[in-house]
C-alpha cells in the first residue's frame, strides 16, 4: 500500500476523502485534516505539510487549502443568534432568534424574519425544526381557545366550571374561555329563560 505522494496515471487516488490528485506532477498527495491548512505543497518527493488554523479561523473538512477560512459572527441585524462558537474545525453555528424564521437559505440560514401572528381562535402548527419556516396557523381544536394575536400563543383547554364548584354561564368558543358563575348567582336577564310579567 503506497503512501502519499505516489504516482497515479489514471487521475484517481485511492482515498478520495484524505487525498487529492496533483495533475502537474501526476501524483496523489495528502489533504490536510479539519482544523488545518496546507503550509507547504506536496512534490514528487515530499508529501503535503499541514499547519493548524490560527485563532478565529477554521477549515471544516479534509482539504488542500493554503489558508484557513475566517470565522464569521452570527449577524443580529439579519435576525441570527449564536448557538455554538467557531472552532478551528467548525464555523460559527447560528440559528434564528426566538420569534423569527429563516427567510433566506444558501447552504445555511442567512436572513431571518419575524414570524406572522396567528389570530384569535388559531395557533401556529408545531414544526419538526424551530425557525425553519413561517407560521402556518391552524384552528384551535374542539374544547380549546386562544384569545390573542400572537406568533407563539397556544390554544388552551376551556375552563371546566364544575372542577371549581361553579356552573357555566356562557360556553367557550375558539376565541374565548368558558364563563363560569357561582351556582347561587342568578342568571343575567338576557340569559334567563323566563321573563317576569
Amino acid at each position: 500500500q503506497a503512501v502519499p505522494p505516489y504516482a497515479s496515471e489514471n487521475q484517481t487516488c485511492r482515498d478520495q476523502e484524505k487525498e487529492y490528485y496533483e495533475p502537474q506532477h501526476r501524483i496523489c498527495c495528502s489533504r490536510c485534516p479539519p482544523g488545518t491548512y496546507v503550509s507547504a505543497k506536496c512534490s514528487r518527493i515530499r508529501d503535503t505539510v499541514c499547519a493548524t488554523c490560527a485563532e478565529n479561523s477554521y477549515n471544516e473538512h479534509w482539504n488542500y487549502l493554503t489558508i484557513c477560512q475566517l470565522c464569521r459572527p452570527c449577524d443580529p441585524v439579519m435576525g441570527l443568534e449564536e448557538i455554538a462558537p467557531c472552532t478551528s474545525k467548525r464555523k460559527t453555528q447560528c440559528r434564528c432568534q426566538p420569534g423569527m424564521f429563516c427567510a433566506a437559505w444558501a447552504l445555511e440560514c442567512t436572513h431571518c424574519e419575524l414570524l406572522s401572528d396567528c389570530p384569535p381562535g388559531t395557533e401556529a402548527e408545531l414544526k419538526d425544526e424551530v425557525g425553519k419556516g413561517n407560521n402556518h396557523c391552524v384552528p384551535c381544536k374542539a374544547g380549546h381557545f386562544q384569545n390573542t394575536s400572537s406568533p407563539s400563543a397556544r390554544c388552551q383547554p376551556h375552563t371546566r366550571c364544575e372542577n371549581q364548584g361553579l356552573v357555566e354561564a356562557a360556553p367557550g368558543t375558539a376565541q374565548s374561555d368558558t364563563t363560569c358563575k357561582n351556582p347561587l348567582e342568578p342568571l343575567p336577564p338576557e340569559m334567563s329563560g323566563t321573563m317576569l310579567m
Epitope: E17, K18, Y20, E60, H61, N63, Y64
Partner: nanobody, 117 residues
Framework: DVQLVESGGGLVQPGGSLRLSCAAS????????MYWYRQAPGKQRELVAI???????NYADSVKGRFTISRDNAKNTVYLQMNSLRPEDTAVYYC???????????WGQGTLVTVSS
C-alpha cells in the same frame, strides 16, 4: 451529487476555433480547481489546462498561446477557448473538477473535437 456537462465540440477546419463549456449542477458549492483533459484515440488522457481556485492558470506546452481556460463562478461553468486548431488537437475533451475545501472529484462525459479539412 455534482454533475458536469460539456458542450461545444464538433468538426472544425485546421486554423479554426471552438469554445468548449463545462457546466456544473447538483450540489455544487465550495472551492474548486477546474481542469480540461483530452484523450486522443489510442493515447493516454493528458492534461490540457488548469484553473485553480486562487485564480492561477496553466497549460500543456502543446497548447500554450493557442488555448485559454476561464471560469464563470456565478454560472458554475469553466470554458476552454481553442484557437489555431491543428489536426493533432483531435480528441475527446473532458472537464474535471476537484473540490479544494472538502473531498470531491468529478468528471464530465466528454465532448469530441475533430480538426480536419
Amino acid at each position: 451529487d455534482v454533475q458536469l456537462v460539456e458542450s461545444g465540440g464538433g468538426l472544425v477546419q485546421p486554423g479554426g476555433s471552438l469554445r468548449l463549456s463545462c457546466a456544473a449542477s447538483g450540489r455544487f458549492f465550495g472551492i474548486y480547481d477546474m481542469y480540461w483533459y483530452r484523450q486522443a484515440p489510442g493515447k493516454q488522457r493528458e492534461l490540457v489546462a488548469i484553473s485553480t481556485s486562487g485564480g492561477h492558470t496553466n497549460y500543456a506546452d502543446s497548447v500554450k498561446g493557442r488555448f485559454t481556460i476561464s471560469r464563470d463562478n456565478a454560472k458554475n461553468t469553466v470554458y476552454l477557448q481553442m484557437n489555431s486548431l491543428r489536426p493533432e488537437d483531435t480528441a475527446v475533451y473532458y472537464c474535471n473538477i476537484q473540490r479544494v475545501d472538502a473531498p470531491g472529484f468529478y468528471w464530465g462525459q466528454g465532448t469530441l473535437v475533430t480538426v480536419s479539412s
